[in-house]
């Protein structure tokens, strides 16, 4: 294993709250600028497990707007365009990090928070429980 | 209408880097404690657009481990268990926030970064381009 040496140019860490409280530069670096714009633009409509987009907005959080997927049907869309209830539309969930203002309404103090979001839906074969 | 007053208990903001650099409490509050642990554990295998999970590890990032979905097939699995190439398995992508150590190897100094991750796959009807 590699033990990375500490950079001598690091900010002072003698703060009584260290290492729980750290300095974070909020000038976000976006690594996605050159991605293919056609990426996943309308999958929510074209999927066999289509979903609607719910807007979750909170001014005390960054990002302040998070899009949540809500599966449109319990079943999946078949080749005829009908809902097939022998299959299930299920949300694909992911834990994401957000910044929560703490104390509330403070412009320069935050706490990391983990929240679970539904990103989209997928069609799965159901688990069938056989009753004895 | 409400204009939220600044909390008088906010940390000092006279820092020369303010407001770009802020204090963040890394003692993560997890809002997901009551979620069903079986959530989407095996959807990657049961989906009609199954995926594999690849481990993306970076010690200079928090979280240091991110799981990336890679669709197993170009097409989708049909009722017979075969790959149907008239449909497409596509990744559902999401932008997430991570913390990047800056300067590198510093334990208490970070920069916010947005990265794009594939969370899972869904089965979509292809877009057919007709050539005149």
């Amino acid at each position: 294993g590699i033990t990375i040496p500490r950079n001598p140019g690091c900010p002072n860490s003698e703060d009584k709250n260290f290492p729980r409280t750290v300095m974070v530069n909020l000038n976000i670096h976006n690594r996605n600028t050159n991605t293919n714009p056609k990426r996943s633009s309308d999958y929510y409509n074209r999927s066999t497990s289509p979903w609607n987009l719910h807007r979750n907005e909170d001014p005390e959080r960054y990002p302040s707007v998070i899009w949540e997927a809500k599966c449109r049907h319990l079943g999946c869309i078949n080749a005829d365009g009908n809902v097939d209830y022998h299959m299930n539309s299920v949300p694909i969930q992911q834990e994401i990090l957000v910044l929560r203002r703490e104390p509330p309404h403070c412009p320069n103090s935050f706490r990391l928070e983990k929240i679970l979001v539904s990103v989209g839906c997928t069609c799965v074969t159901p688990i069938v429980h056989h009753v004895a | 209408g409400i204009t939220i007053p600044r909390n008088p208990g906010c940390p000092n903001s006279e820092d020369k880097n303010f407001p770009r650099t802020v204090m963040v409490n890394l003692n993560i509050h997890n809002r997901n404690t009551n979620t069903n642990p079986k959530r989407s554990s095996d959807y990657y295998n049961r989906s009609t657009s199954p995926w594999n999970l690849h481990r993306n590890e970076d010690p200079e990032r928090y979280p240091s481990v991110i799981w990336e979905a890679k669709c197993r097939h170009l097409g989708c699995i049909n009722a017979d268990g075969n790959v149907d190439y008239h449909m497409n398995s596509v990744p559902i992508q999401q932008e997430i926030l991570v913390l990047r150590r800056e300067p590198p190897h510093c334990p208490n100094s970070f920069r916010l970064e947005k990265i794009l991750v594939s969370v899972g796959c869904t089965c979509v009807t292809p877009i057919v381009h007709h050539v005149a």
Epitope: L26, N30, T35, R55, P59, S64, V65, P107 | R20
Partner: antibody
Framework: EVQLLESGGGLVQPGGSLRLSCAAS????????MLWVRQAPGKGLEWVSS????????MYADSVKGRFTISRDNSKNTLYLQMNSLRAEDTAVYYC??????????????????????WGQGTLVTVSS | QSALTQPPSASGTPGQRVTISCSGS????????VNWYQQLPGTAPKLLIY???QRPSGVPDRFSGSKSGTSAPLAISGLQSEDEADYYC???????????FGGGTKLTVL
Amino acid sequence: EVQLLESGGGLVQPGGSLRLSCAASGFTFSLYDMLWVRQAPGKGLEWVSSISSSGGVTMYADSVKGRFTISRDNSKNTLYLQMNSLRAEDTAVYYCTTDPGNYYDSSGYGWLGPGVNLWGQGTLVTVSS
Amino acid sequence: QSALTQPPSASGTPGQRVTISCSGSSSNIGSNTVNWYQQLPGTAPKLLIYSNNQRPSGVPDRFSGSKSGTSAPLAISGLQSEDEADYYCAVWDDSLNGWVFGGGTKLTVL
């Protein structure tokens, strides 16, 4: 200066095409969801299309679905609206605007201030024979 | 016809309090936050209220928004001549996967 500037409007015949552009400056464009909103002469505001900050999700009003395409180039700080199969009822002033929910506390963060919502000056599209 | 219903016009005298209604449904106002825009003649719209009741900096506290169920009124107290404009409510609609605007209310200061 923080601003949005639309261009590309003009007179076009029914069935024709136009491409609108919206150049952003003075803020971190790649962090914002963007919208196109239009206003027909003497009428109210109508949402046309939205695109997420990365360009990964696009949404359209039913009235333009299949005819209009929204896109963005974050490296050029520019939002686009490709309009095909134009109809007389598409005649309107077209505005680009930031999502009103992408607010934050100080422009020094690289984000806009609380509730700061940018609108361009608008570009007029006239569809007529 | 708009998914959000606003009265086409409203009026008041200087100093008066005026309320503009905006009613929708469970898929829009009932489940999402409401924004209000002011559009002065010949200009682009301006955000007046966001997240139901928040005022952007620079917007006078005479303007206030609220939300209850599927309706979200805008109140303007101490009416002034410069408030004469068109006012629009807007909200995301979960069912339509899109933004919906009210038809707009023309406010006249008598």
